[in-house]
């Protein structure tokens, strides 16, 4: 087969700009070019054939990879029909999973669907687009290509492109995509973003307020911790790190470190500025009087694990 405008090259892969309105190539031919450049007519699968799960060996057909069925290979087959799959299988279906192919990442622009061919890929372009990758637009403003109230500029003649100026909340070359404004994560401090179409709303977590949950209602500003305590922010609330001997939300409550009777075996507890101190009864030792002292002078410390000497610091669980 020979190339037809507007593609050039030995495989009709390079495009040339048509002098007038773009010509429609015959079915099964890529948009192509001068007669001296020869190319093979690529395999064009059935329109709509799934680029991921379908392929063709004859023009127009849509043959399904294992695990898929339907006219366009869009329907997963139940695992019962994949009892003895050949090749790598999917854990979810038990069916053959195709490896990476030329359509991975979808090389077709402007909403074109990609079909694998024996040598490369083929793009099935939506109406108004053509070219190897559907990158050339044959649409003008007269066709009304801008959706959702987009303003069309340019494109007075078939060879010139058009540009859609999209209204707020829409994007894409044809303003066809609603902007997911919440993907920009405008709500601070863990607020929940709600796109209402006409506006964004942030649903704030407890302790935060403002249009973007930017105000911390429970912050340390204007909040003093009593008795030398230090204010610490975090987790949508504030807390006070209290000085020794004080406790409570604002460190206003006097705390007695000896109230919990931390000294064992009758040891006496004394509150001290650096913490509590235990005065142990005769025959006991340790920070909390927890270890009995043996008459021969050896203490009943637990045996040290391998690699530690008995005198080394240890943590006992």
């Amino acid at each position: 087969a020979r190339c037809e405008p507007p593609a050039v090259g030995t495989a009709c892969t390079r495009l040339c700009r048509p002098r007038s309105a773009p010509s429609r190539c015959g079915p099964g031919l890529r948009p192509c070019a001068p007669l001296e450049d020869e190319c093979e007519a690529p395999l064009v699968c059935r329109a709509g054939c799934s680029p991921e799960h379908g392929f063709c060996e004859q023009p127009g057909e849509c043959r399904c990879l294992e695990g898929w069925t339907g006219p366009l290979c869009t329907v997963p087959v139940s695992t019962s029909s994949c009892l003895s799959p050949r090749g790598p299988s999917s854990a979810t279906t038990g069916c053959l999973v195709p490896g990476p192919g030329p359509c991975d990442g979808n090389p077709c622009a402007n909403g074109g669907s990609c079909s694998e061919t024996p040598r490369s890929f083929e793009c099935t372009c939506p109406r108004g687009f053509y070219g190897l990758r559907c990158e050339v637009s044959g649409v003008t403003c007269a066709d009304g290509p801008c959706f959702n109230g987009g303003l069309c500029v340019g494109g007075a003649d078939p060879d010139s492109a058009y540009i859609c100026h999209c209204p707020p909340g829409f994007q894409g070359s044809n303003c066809e995509k609603r902007v997911d404004r919440c993907s920009l994560q405008p709500c601070r401090n863990g607020g929940l973003c709600l796109d209402l179409g006409h506006a964004l709303r942030c649903r704030c977590r407890a302790g935060f307020a403002g249009p973007r949950c930017e105000h911390d209602l429970d912050d340390c500003a204007g909040r003093a911790c009593a008795n030398g305590g230090t204010c610490v922010e975090g987790g949508g609330a504030h807390r006070c790190s209290c000085a020794l001997g004080f406790g409570g939300r604002d460190c206003r409550e006097r705390a007695d470190p000896c109230a919990a009777r931390p000294c064992a075996h009758g040891g006496r507890c004394y509150a001290h500025f650096s913490g509590l101190v235990c005065a142990c009864a005769p025959g006991y030792m340790g920070a909390r009087c927890e270890f009995p002292v043996h008459p021969d002078g050896a203490s009943a410390l637990p045996a040290a694990p391998p690699g530690l000497r008995p005198g080394d610091p240890q943590r006992y669980l």
Epitope: G26, G60, P71, V75, C125, R127
Partner: antibody, heavy 119, light 107 residues
Amino acid sequence: QVQLQQSGGDLMKPGASVKISCKAAGYTFSNYYIEWVKQRPGHGLEWIGEILPGSGSTTYNEKFKGKASFTADTSSNTAYMQLSSLTSEDSAVYYCARWGAREPGFPYWGQGTLVTVSA
Amino acid sequence: DIVMTQSQKFMSTSVGDRVSVTCKASQNVGTNVAWYQQKPGQSPKALIYSASYRYSGVPDRFTGSGSGTDFTLTISNVQSEDLAEYFCQQYNNYPLTFGAGTKLELK
């Protein structure tokens, strides 16, 4: 442009067979599915099946297996549907249609063939 | 088989109105749905493919929407030539199936 020209209507006897033709023009006949659709008053549209002329591969609606069979002659760009063992239930308009080139579905239709089965 | 249900057999409208024809699939068909218009004594005419794309030459007052199981054909600014029967079709699964049709009539 794409054209599908169907054969004329037939009055058939019960038990007989009829072969409807669909001649295509304006495109590469081999490369696109020819679809066959039945329409009876009050029954809407029913898909009978399809044939890809280039490979001869066919897919039938289970409901019409044994009733309809498809063939295609690429030299004359003509698709055929044969209906066998006709009954009054087969009285209907039968359409051929072509699958789209870039867009899925049936953008091109023949004018229809009326088959009437009557004793 | 997938059943395409067009719950309204008839719909009354006036010229200039906006009317929506609905179609419900018995299971998920993605966007593999087409809409056709048929006038008495004529072959069906393709309007919409892939649920929301107009076939070439179809006026832009016809718009399609939906995915999964619920689909709608909307005709804004109805013209007298739009009075016809409308069929939806799924081509996601074999066998391909059509809805029973919705006839658009004048009030």
